[in-house]
Interface confidence: low
């Protein structure tokens, strides 16, 4: 599996990332384009230099690193700001560390990330392609203080690794703000009071609260003085307080959107109630399928058709305007044998989708909700067989086990009765003289008989062949409402 | 379930309501075969007698039970021998498998759910005023790796390897009292697999306090042995 690295080693001759802006913010010109600049380097002339799209590259081994032709007619080319790969050392907390150290700080050998022994764990490399969980190298996929690994010692589940800190300045973490934007990870203002009015403890102090959110442990988070910050991905900037009874609290930071935002409002809002219709089957080769399934036969999530990540492709809505290439829904734009999609797994380019062919009777336009009801003890069955005790039986048998014809449920001859009539039990299917089970009798469907000496008797209704339901497969599609 | 939403009726057909013999719901459970229900051991603390319990299958409403609902007595109780919070109930007669009553699938032994996998909890438990009381509710929650869940600010080392955490660290969505013993299922390929049994939490839906579930994959060998030998 190729890990697409967004960093450069040395002069970046082998950089194959997707940066497409110069260090001055100008968008790069496509390498295959001749406008506004006629290139000396193009995919045709230099096929092995990775000159895709308009990504920064270094086809001429320029010592200043990756560059590109720009879309500004006045500036032929410009250099790009590409991070140095952290191969020998780490910046910040080592979130992007890409090196090969595989021993913990106490000298224990690391367990491979794709192994579940001796420690079972949930950091499965295939599920986190961007985290570069290679071999048994120390990594930091979870906001730890620095790279770590599970150990090969059964008695020590995990431990931090000792990675030297880079001496070059760390990469810029993007724009910073004096107001609250998002969860405030880039807030760099000077508020130093919590929502309850407590003064913040200095980040470098260990009284009244001892902690590990120190400037040394979080060198890129600007833990200056006692200013509110969000170094660890909480909901908003916060700080330890100088009140020994209150360990930490959120701060009230004015929102960048002018209206003040309380920490209670920081939970994300749900998307609009747009429940797509699930069309769970397709006709023919599925070129007409317009459902919303987006899962492949092996359970992988589909990549959006308009996205080029992780797989670059030509099957775009622009190139196939009539193929319904909406979002990441399964489609068949190229007359393949059934609906398919590119997958979000970088190691599997495409797969067919987890869809069945429609049987001849199913409509191609599916109205919500797509609930397939199979007969059970409640759903009336018109077949001449019964499920369970036959309470839902609605067949046309009208003779008892001895062959005596049944009395009409509405009739009072030869037997007068008042409990089980069409009027008193309008939903029990007491039509004509058909065998029924209005009272859920364990003996099954019965009827009043036309024999004056026999009030009622059971009917001989066979059990239907039990429908086969696979484990874990509901017949009613779950709502799957988001948790928040 | 605190937060989440009211489920589509019968969309979680393995959901069981575990009741006193007088019909009061007190815990959830999961149908794993026509004759077997998996629940939490702490749900069976009140009485060691199977006759104290009955199960309700195919229900959506907690009280006004629909006519198709199946009510079955319990014939035997099996507590996990190392005192983990998981137990099996053998039904006195097999459930009728219908479109409203379908077992959940068991995971393969020792399978580990990947961190951040979105899974679903269901139950008739306490809603803490979040709407839907008395109806089966569901919520979607991400699994949180034990390493993270055991951090000081979260559950501070309380979570064992035979358990898993799930929840939003912002709080607001969680299982709660009355959901215990019920399922945490995760969709894998084309079906839902029972990965957790609702077990415990520090309060319900509190920020930084995810719910804790028994990790079913660690007990599949025990479960299959009990079912095979009984």
């Amino acid at each position: 599996k190729v890990y697409l690295s967004e960093c450069k080693t040395g002069n970046g001759k082998n950089y194959r990332g997707t940066m497409s802006k110069t260090k001055n913010g100008i968008t790069c010109q496509k390498w295959s384009s001749t406008s506004p600049h006629r290139p000396r380097f193009s995919p045709a002339t230099h096929p092995s230099e990775g000159l895709e799209e308009n990504y920064c590259r270094n086809p001429d081994n320029d010592p200043q690193g990756p560059w590109c032709y720009t879309t500004d007619p006045e500036k032929r080319y410009d250099y790009c700001d590409i991070l140095e790969c952290e191969e020998e050392c780490m910046h910040c907390s080592g979130e992007n560390y890409d090196g090969k150290i595989s021993k913990t700080m106490s000298g224990l050998e690391c367990q491979a990330w794709d192994s579940q022994s001796p420690h079972a764990h949930g950091y499965i490399p295939s599920k986190f392609p961007n985290k570069n969980l290679k071999k048994n190298y120390c990594r930091n996929p979870d906001r730890e203080l620095r790279p770590w690994c599970f150990t090969t010692d059964p008695n020590k589940r995990w431990e931090l690794c000792d990675i030297p800190r880079c001496t070059t300045p760390p990469p810029s973490s993007g724009p910073t703000y004096q107001c609250l934007k998002g969860t405030g990870e880039n807030y760099r203002g000077n508020v130093a009071v919590t929502v309850s009015g407590h003064t913040c403890q200095h980040w470098s102090a260990q009284t009244p609260h001892t902690h590990n959110r120190t400037p040394e442990n979080f060198p890129c988070k600007n833990l200056d003085e006692n200013y509110c910050r969000n170094p660890d991905g909480k909901r908003a900037p916060w700080c330890h307080t100088t009140n020994s009874q209150v360990r930490w609290e959120y701060c009230k930071i004015p929102s960048c959107d002018s209206s003040p935002v309380s920490t209670e409002q920081l939970a994300p809002t749900a998307p609009p109630e747009l429940t797509p219709v699930v069309q769970d089957c397709y006709h023919g080769d599925g070129q007409s399928y317009r459902g919303t399934s987006s899962t492949t036969t092996t359970g992988k999530k589909c990549q959006s058709w308009s996205s080029m990540t992780p797989h670059r492709h030509q099957k775009t809505p622009e190139n196939y305007p009539n193929a319904g290439l909406t979002m990441n829904y399964c489609r068949n734009p190229d007359a393949d044998k059934g609906p398919w999609c590119f997958t979000t797994d970088p190691s599997v380019r495409w797969e067919y989708c987890n869809l069945k062919k429609c049987s001849g009777t199913e409509a191609s336009v599916v109205a919500p909700p797509p609930v397939v009801l199979l007969p059970d003890v409640e759903t009336p069955s018109e077949e001449d067989c019964m499920f369970g005790n036959g309470k839902g039986y609605r067949g046309k048998r009208a003779t008892t086990v001895t062959g005596t014809p049944c009395q009409d449920w509405a009739a009072q001859e030869p037997h007068r009765h008042s409990i089980f009539t069409p009027e008193t039990n309008p939903r029990a299917g007491l039509e004509k003289n058909y065998c029924r089970n209005p009272d859920g009798d364990v003996g099954g469907p019965w009827c009043y008989t036309t024999n004056p000496r026999k009030l009622y008797d059971y009917c001989d209704v066979p059990q239907c062949a039990a429908p086969s339901f696979d484990c874990g497969k509901p017949q009613v599609e779950p709502k799957k409402c988001p948790g928040r | 379930v605190v937060g989440g939403c009211v489920a589509h009726p019968h969309s979680w057909p393995w959901q069981v309501s575990l009741r006193t013999r007088f019909g009061m719901h007190f815990c959830g459970g999961t149908l794993i075969s026509p004759e077997w229900v998996l629940t939490a051991a702490h749900c069976l603390e009140k009485s060691p007698r199977p006759s104290s319990y009955k199960v309700i299958l195919g229900a959506h409403q907690e009280v006004n039970l629909e006519p198709h609902v199946q009510e079955i007595e319990v014939s035997r109780l099996f507590l996990e021998p190392t005192r983990k919070d998981i137990a099996l109930l053998k039904l006195s007669s097999p459930a009728v498998i219908t479109d409203k009553v379908i077992p959940a699938c068991l995971p393969s032994p020792n399978y580990v759910v990947a961190d951040r996998t979105e899974c679903f909890i269901t139950g008739w438990g306490e809603t803490q005023g979040t709407f839907g009381a008395g109806l089966l509710k569901e919520a979607q929650l991400p699994v949180i790796e034990n390493k993270v869940c055991n951090r000081y600010e979260f559950l501070n080392g309380r979570v064992q390897s035979t358990e898993l955490c799930a929840g939003h660290l912002a709080g607001g969505t969680d299982s709660c009292q009355g959901d215990s013993g019920g399922p945490l299922v995760c969709f894998e390929k084309d079906k839902y697999i029972l990965q957790g049994v609702t077990s415990w939490g520090l309060g319900c839906a509190r920020p930084n306090k995810p719910g804790v579930y028994v990790r079913v994959s660690r007990f599949v060998t025990w479960i299959e042995g009990v079912m095979r030998n009984n």
């Epitope: 979130e95 961007n130 979870d142 969860t183 991905g233 998307p271 959006s304 | 949180i144 660290l169």
Partner: nanobody, 124 residues
């Protein structure tokens, strides 16, 4: 999770112009595609324009030459410049983005988020 907020909708005369913005916020790790969709009353939601992280753009046939999608990756924002507006362009315009976000403990999860929509009205 990731929130998208659209702005810039409003009432404009046929032949006029509007510029829609859509800003993404939340613990975003990376955004792949950012798209504009629209939905007129009684009609299906349709893709209007899309732009990838590398700057590749796609447009619906009905808006080609009139609408321009652009994107500021540093600001996690996408724009839709709409010129020569026609009455049939009137609709709710929704922003859609997919990529990875890091939720609280920084483990990546995929997202595919929608904005709440902004209304564009074109009078003739």
């Amino acid at each position: 999770q990731v929130q998208l907020v659209e702005t810039g909708g409003g009432l404009v005369q046929a032949g006029g112009s509007l510029r829609l913005s859509c800003a993404a916020s939340g613990n975003i790790f990376s955004i792949n595609a950012m798209d504009w969709y629209r939905q007129a009353p009684g009609k299906e939601r349709e893709l209007v324009a899309a732009i990838t992280s590398g700057g590749t753009t796609n447009y619906a046939d009905s808006v080609k030459g009139r609408f321009t999608i652009s994107r500021d990756n540093a600001k996690d924002t996408v724009y839709l410049q709409m010129n020569s507006l026609k009455p049939e362009d009137a609709a709710f315009y929704y922003c859609n983005a997919d990529g990875y976000y890091s939720d609280y403990d920084k483990n990546l999860a995929e997202f595919n988020s929608w904005g709440q929509g902004t209304q564009v009205t074109v009078s003739s």
